[in-house]
């Protein structure tokens, strides 16, 4: 807390300008009117204030707006945004995408801070859902944003917003998140033709069920191995050798290099060795000929 002292004669600020960089902290506190600061916030960013001077300016705004800053001030915070705490930001009502962009721009290159996380949370909650424009903006600044959300939060993403998602935005998503996103993507892209549909849905396939993979295998999609390796193991296991061969097309040869890794390893263990041999890849570990395969999960379901 800066103690209250009278402003020295002739030092009362009439506008926010560069002369203020020469003011000591107590002079800024005493000589800068908070209302003047609020109306000229757009100038602050152009003036090379120290962090300590910015602390004083923040304190003045806090006194003027104890219930939270108005959006007209928030939009022009600039560097001062980096001084805000999550508690400060929780008092804000940010509705304009332009304001969000301005603040994310200030934070560009910084780590995703608690302040930014709080700002985004406030903004999205205020909008009620993660619409396409917001998602576009957030993933532009933070490619990993989508995967930082819980499955519950992702459930509020409307299918229409999925069009804003780029493959790299899903790089760090886990299967639980893809389980939520995949049905939305399927809905969003449902009117596209086969090859275009596959290009769009490919990044989301880590959430696809067996029946959708079977359907894709009938469409000559030539799935690459990187995509195949990200599929849910439980979705891959029921696929036949013929279905996997059709699904991968020319990429089927890549199975040999991945035979020790999931889901390929587990899939191999479920196939008849005879069937695996038809691929001509030398895949080993399938069920030997003459063995009877009992589906215990089916047996449990019936009992």
């Amino acid at each position: 807390e800066v103690e209250k002292t009278a402003c020295p004669s002739g030092k009362k600020a009439r506008e926010i300008d560069e002369s203020l960089i020469f003011y000591k902290k107590w002079e800024l506190e005493a000589c800068v009117d908070a209302a003047l600061l609020a109306t000229q916030m757009d100038r602050v960013n152009a003036i090379p204030f120290t962090y300590e001077q910015l602390d004083v300016l923040k304190h003045k705004l806090d006194e003027l707006y104890p219930q939270g800053y108005p959006e007209s001030v928030i939009q022009h915070l600039g560097y001062l945004f980096l001084k805000m705490s999550p508690e400060d930001i929780r008092k804000w009502n940010v509705t304009s995408l332009e304001t969000l962009k301005a603040l994310l721009e200030v934070n560009k290159g910084h780590e995703m801070s608690p302040q930014v996380a709080t700002l985004i949370d406030r903004f999205v909650k205020g909008r009620g859902q993660l619409d396409k424009d917001t998602l576009d903006t957030l993933t532009a600044f933070y490619p990993g944003y989508l995967c930082s959300l819980s499955p519950e939060e992702l459930s509020s993403v409307p299918p229409s917003s999925i069009w804003a998602v780029r493959p790299q935005d899903l790089d760090t998503c886990d299967p639980r998140q893809l389980d939520v996103l995949y049905p939305k993507a399927r809905l969003a892209f449902q009117n596209m033709n086969g090859s275009e549909y596959f290009v769009k849905i490919q990044s989301f396939l880590g959430g696809a069920p067996t029946e959708d993979l079977k359907a894709l295998s009938q469409q000559n999609v030539s799935m690459d191995l990187a995509t195949f390796m990200k599929l849910r193991t439980d979705a891959v296991l029921p696929l036949t050798v013929a279905e996997v061969q059709k699904l991968l097309g020319p990429h089927v040869e890549g199975l040999k290099a991945e035979e020790r890794h999931r889901p390929v390893r587990d899939w191999i263990l479920r196939q008849r060795q005879d069937d695996l041999d038809t691929l001509g890849l030398g895949l080993q570990g399938g069920i030997p000929n003459g063995y009877l395969v009992l589906d215990l999960s089916m047996q449990e379901a019936l009992s």
Epitope: T50, Y51, Q115
Partner: antibody, heavy 117, light 107 residues
Framework: QVQLVESGGGLVKPGGSLRLSCAAS????????MTWIRQAPGKGLEWISY????????YYADSVKGRFTISRDNAKNSLYLQMNSLRAEDTAVYYC??????????WGQGTLVTVSS | DIQMTQSPSSVSASVGDRVTITCRAS??????LAWYQQKPGKAPKLLIY???VLQSGVPSRFSGSGSGTDFTLTISSLQPEDFATYYC?????????FGQGTKVEIK
């Protein structure tokens, strides 16, 4: 008087790790932002990371992002730089400095990091 | 990123000379500019910040001017202890960037 003393430099193989420390004295450490700046032999200065007074705001230059981690312990008046996956191009004298936003007003004497096989 | 370009890269001068070093930013930085002096084997030392504010304890023969994209560091009367390398640095945006340095040598 304000003093910043770096330590932890040395010779490390490519791919290796090193942790630099900066001990601060003569000022209220917890009130100030801090920065790491490096200088390759015979070259200019490169700003690589900063951390806010509380530690909640952090920035890394692209050249070290994902490999280096800045942190601070205000109770110990110390700043740290954890450097992983080191490369030959990380060879430099590493300085810690007090960051005032518009300038760096005090610098340590530097600690040399050499990355070589 | 904002590029900072200093000129000249080196200057030879005698004691008592007036020396001027310029620094140009690739985009406008208002007055977010600082100047540092570095001697061999030593850490840089702050001379000027906010383009023209002299750091406490720095001799008044050093002065800075400029705003926007063009800035100048002037040493009005060069002293023996001033032979060093000088760097400009912008704080207008992240990442902070430095000029490549100007070496002031004895003629």
């Amino acid at each position: 008087q304000v003093q910043l003393v770096e330590s932890g430099g040395g010779l490390v193989k490519p791919g290796g790790s090193l942790r630099l420390s900066c001990a601060a004295s003569g000022f209220t450490f917890s009130d100030y932002y801090m920065t790491w700046i490096r200088q390759a032999p015979g070259k200019g200065l490169e700003w690589i990371s900063y951390i806010s007074s509380s530690g909640s705001t952090i920035y890394y230059a692209d050249s070290v992002k994902g490999r280096f981690t800045i942190s601070r312990d205000n109770a110990k008046n110390s700043l740290y730089l954890q450097m992983n996956s080191l490369r030959a191009e990380d060879t430099a004298v590493y300085y810690c400095a007090r960051d005032r936003n518009s300038h760096f007003d005090y610098w340590g004497q530097g600690t040399l990091v050499t990355v070589s096989s | 990123d904002i590029q900072m370009t200093q000129s000249p890269s080196s200057v030879s001068a005698s004691v008592g000379d007036r020396v001027t070093i310029t620094c140009r930013a690739s985009q406008g930085i208002t007055r977010w500019l600082a100047w540092y002096q570095q001697k061999p084997g030593k850490a840089p030392k702050l001379l000027i910040y906010a383009a023209s504010v002299l750091q406490s304890g720095v001799p008044s023969r050093f002065s800075g001017s400029g705003s926007g994209t063009d800035f100048t560091l002037t040493i009005s009367s060069l002293q023996p202890e001033d032979f060093a390398t000088y760097y400009c640095q912008q704080s207008n945006s992240f990442p902070r960037t430095f000029g490549q340095g100007t070496k002031v040598e004895i003629k």
